[in-house]
């Protein structure tokens, strides 16, 4: 048969951050090509990345149609130059991915502090509301649009002159914190989805400190 040297894909892995979702697998192809199919549990299979020599396939466009659905993908292996060929059972060799539910599993990307503004002894710290590739009514939704109150942010802040840290939480994208007048502070934020059991926290944002460009000061 023409499939003698065709091997099934293995180590199928979902890589997803802020809903940008790529399926990766092994091995690097030798004399074979791959096609990926994706479906929801109850839906039809849709083919993507036809006859590719890549070992990854961007499935973002499919999963953003409904991020709360659970998806399954499969990777078909075909002999290079003979993609009509089938395996001994009469169909191409393929391997299933683990199930993937974007809303519950996509990694939270590193957040960014958009700005901070001091007014007297209060500082308002604003977290950038990152745009995702999830669409509604032809517009891209932000992370907050998608997750709503399921998404919180944790702020870490400390005086530039000391190591003692404080923390605050918000269910919006803004913090209003008390500071000592005349002191400079540094800030870092982290995104959290407390209801999750996996991929609950993002990495910390880059640290931003008062006395640098992002801030504004008013008496």
């Amino acid at each position: 048969s023409g499939t003698t040297n065709t091997v099934a894909a293995y180590n199928l892995t979902w890589k997803s951050t802020n809903f940008k979702t790529i399926l990766e697998w092994e091995p690097k192809p030798v004399n074979q090509v791959y096609t990926v199919q994706i479906s929801t549990k109850s839906g039809d299979w849709k083919s993507k990345c036809f006859y590719t020599t890549d070992t990854e396939c961007d499935l973002t466009d499919e999963i953003v149609k409904d991020v709360k659905q659970t998806y399954l993908a499969r990777v078909f292996s075909y002999p290079a130059g003979n993609v009509e060929s089938t395996g001994s059972a009469g169909e191409p060799l393929y391997e299933n991915s683990p199930e993937f539910t974007p809303y519950l599993e996509t990694n939270l990307g590193q957040p960014t502090i958009q700005s901070f503004e001091q007014v007297g002894t209060k500082v308002n710290v604003t977290v950038e509301d990152e745009r995702t590739l999830v669409r509604r009514n032809n517009t891209f939704l932000s992370l907050r649009d998608v997750f709503g109150k399921d998404l919180i942010y944790t702020l870490y802040y400390w005086k530039s002159s000391s190591s003692g840290k404080k923390t605050a939480k918000t269910n919006t994208n803004e913090f209003l914190i008390d500071v000592d007048k005349g002191e400079n502070y540094c800030f870092s934020v982290q995104a959290v989805i407390p209801s999750r059991t996996v991929n609950r926290k993002s990495t910390d944002s880059p640290v931003e400190c008062m006395g640098q460009e992002k801030g504004e000061f008013r008496e």
């Epitope: 919180i152 944790t154 870490y156 840290k165 404080k166 923390t167 605050a168 939480k169 918000t170 269910n171 919006t172 914190i177 982290q190 959290v192 989805i193 407390p194 209801s195 059991t197 996996v198 609950r200 926290k201 990495t203 910390d204």
Partner: antibody, heavy 117, light 107 residues
Framework: QVQLLESGAVLARPGTSVKISCKAS????????MHWVKQRPGQGLEWIGG????????MYDPKFQGRVTITADTSTNTAYMELSSLRSEDTAIYYC??????????WGQGTLVTVSS | DIQMTQSPSSLSASVGDRVTITCKAS??????LSWYQQKPGKAPKLLIY???SLADGVPSRFSGSGSGTDYTLTISSLQPEDIATYYC?????????FGGGTKVEIK
Amino acid sequence: QVQLLESGAVLARPGTSVKISCKASGFNIKDYYMHWVKQRPGQGLEWIGGNDPANGHSMYDPKFQGRVTITADTSTNTAYMELSSLRSEDTAIYYCARDSGYAMDYWGQGTLVTVSS
Amino acid sequence: DIQMTQSPSSLSASVGDRVTITCKASQDIKSFLSWYQQKPGKAPKLLIYYATSLADGVPSRFSGSGSGTDYTLTISSLQPEDIATYYCLQHGESPYTFGGGTKVEIK
């Protein structure tokens, strides 16, 4: 299932230090925040401080700042609290607790620390 | 620092009574408030998280309400096993602060 197992009761002399451990199972401490709470006999609950094991950030109540150090060892999935310069008013039960972001949802059984000469 | 004022400090009620405990924060804590039940010699147990959500395995007679600075724990029909001390906790900002506790007894 989720469990927090604290180290055993300690009798310590005034002026010395004590280090209590809290071994987590059923979850990865890096995915949560870990806190320590003090309860003196017959009294209410008092937050000592907390730690984010993923990045090492630790926060303390100013009342304890300088005397307490909260750390975590992600390789053993264990949180620690060290309290130094012990005095009689440190005699208490010390609880570790997991913070999900919404609440301290799981607590250790408590470690009794008795400070006496 | 945020102060949490919990009231009453103790109460006595009959089995089947509706019991209400309140916590008032000195500033907006954005629903980062949880309620705990503690029985003698035991660790605190989570009842309510995020101000209004019932924790797993907690009887439905317990409920939480409130937002901003004012929060309430309600036991709709007091049962003998509810004899305990109840605490609120704000964790919206460090230092985290507990209310002073409410000791609930049966008449």
